[in-house]
């Protein structure tokens, strides 16, 4: 069964900077990736970026840079302008759409015990049952 993993890391040098990494584990080629925060897109979450393998990326503040890391993984750099670092308690969700298989999505957040510069393990946090 295909799976999506999400990891969130805080930059050691800039505590106001975060990076979200997402990847797709499964067959098929990715047609579109949607990254949102505060929940899944369409379920109360706010869209941060949309990445298309051929047509490029689109991003919305506070997203700073969205890019492909591999053919099946992406990263999104975020700039936290607030002093209180709200990203630390935020859920980030990634949805990978593959044609003609369909879509898979997962959410993750910065672990409470994370030290700056240490990345969270790439443990998938499925928002839907794995058998769907």
């Amino acid at each position: 069964t295909p799976e999506v993993w999400v990891q969130v890391q805080m930059e050691a040098t800039e505590l106001s900077s975060f990076t979200v990494h997402c990847g797709f584990l499964g067959p098929g080629s990715i047609s579109l990736v949607t990254v949102s925060w505060g929940g899944p897109d369409g379920a109360g979450g706010t869209k941060l970026a949309v990445l298309h393998p051929e047509l490029g990326t689109r991003q919305w503040a506070p997203a700073r840079q969205a890019r492909w890391e591999t053919q099946s993984s992406i990263s999104l750099a975020l700039e936290d302008s607030g002093a209180s670092s709200p990203f630390a308690n935020t859920t980030f969700c990634c949805k990978f759409a593959s044609f003609p298989e369909g879509s898979w999505e997962s959410c993750g957040s910065l672990p409470p015990s994370s030290d700056p510069g240490l990345s969270a393990p790439p443990t998938p946090v499925p928002i839907l049952r794995a058998d769907l």
């Epitope: 098929g28 080629s29 047609s31 579109l32 899944p40 897109d41 369409g42 379920a43 949309v50 298309h52 051929e54 047509l55 949805k95 759409a97 044609f99 003609p100 298989e101 369909g102 879509s103 999505e105 839907l128 769907l132």
Partner: antibody, heavy 120, light 107 residues
């Protein structure tokens, strides 16, 4: 203007074969995923077969697997559906449609349809 | 496969009425739901994608809502030209499936 024009439908005997074509124009055909959808006499819609933009990945409805083959020629801007071992339940109006990645793979344009009737 | 149960099958309304069609998925389909309109003698046309986004040129009297398994499609102030069959569709997981359709007739 996006245009999809199906052809190749007709009356065919049980167990016979037919090849449907869909000529695309008004857009970059090679950038879009495509599919064949049929509407049964009871007006039910079924996605019969789908193919991704480069023609590598395909999908088939269980009831047509092994009998139907979807293909595309990006140089000719044409989508095909080769149908063989036709059954009476394949009688339907067959549409080709374009999928839009940015719309959650919704089918944003459909052709006018071509009718397939399988008779005994 | 995911079953999309669409209700009602038939609607008889007067011009100016508000119409609501529902679609229930047998399992979560996220927000990957589209709605199509098929007028007599025409091929289906996309009205809504990602549940609530109107396709180009679709009047704002058409709205959609929902997430997961329960979806609603509404026509506010029905007009005579809305006479058609409406279908919901999930493109979340293959096999992609359609609802059974709702035939809208105007009194």
């Amino acid at each position: 203007d996006v245009k999809l024009v199906e052809s190749g439908g007709g009356l065919v005997k049980l167990g016979g074969s037919l090849k449907l074509s869909c000529a695309a124009s008004g857009f970059t055909f090679s950038s879009y995923h495509m599919s064949w959808i049929r509407q049964t006499p009871e007006k039910r819609l079924e996605l019969v077969a789908a193919i991704n933009s480069n023609g590598i990945n395909t999908y088939y409805l269980d009831t047509v697997k092994g009998r139907f083959t979807i293909s595309r020629d990006n140089a000719k801007n044409t989508l095909y559906l080769q149908m063989s071992s036709l059954k009476s339940e394949d009688t339907a109006l067959y549409y080709c449609a374009r999928h839009e990645d940015y719309y959650g793979f919704a089918m944003d344009y459909w052709g006018q349809g071509t009718s397939v009737t399988v008779s005994s | 496969s995911i079953v999309m149960t669409q209700t009602p099958k038939f609607l008889l309304v007067s011009a100016g009425d508000r119409v609501t069609i529902t679609c229930k998925a047998s399992q979560s389909v996220s927000n990957d739901v589209a709605w199509y309109q098929e007028k007599p003698g025409q091929s289906p046309k996309l009205l809504m994608y990602y549940v609530s986004h109107r396709f180009t040129g679709v009047p704002d009297r058409f709205t959609g809502s929902g997430y997961g398994t329960d979806f609603t499609f509404t026509i506010n102030t029905v007009q005579a030209e809305d006479l058609a069959v409406y279908f919901c569709h999930q493109a979340y997981r293959s096999p992609w499936t359609f609802g059974g359709g709702t035939k809208l007739e105007i009194k």
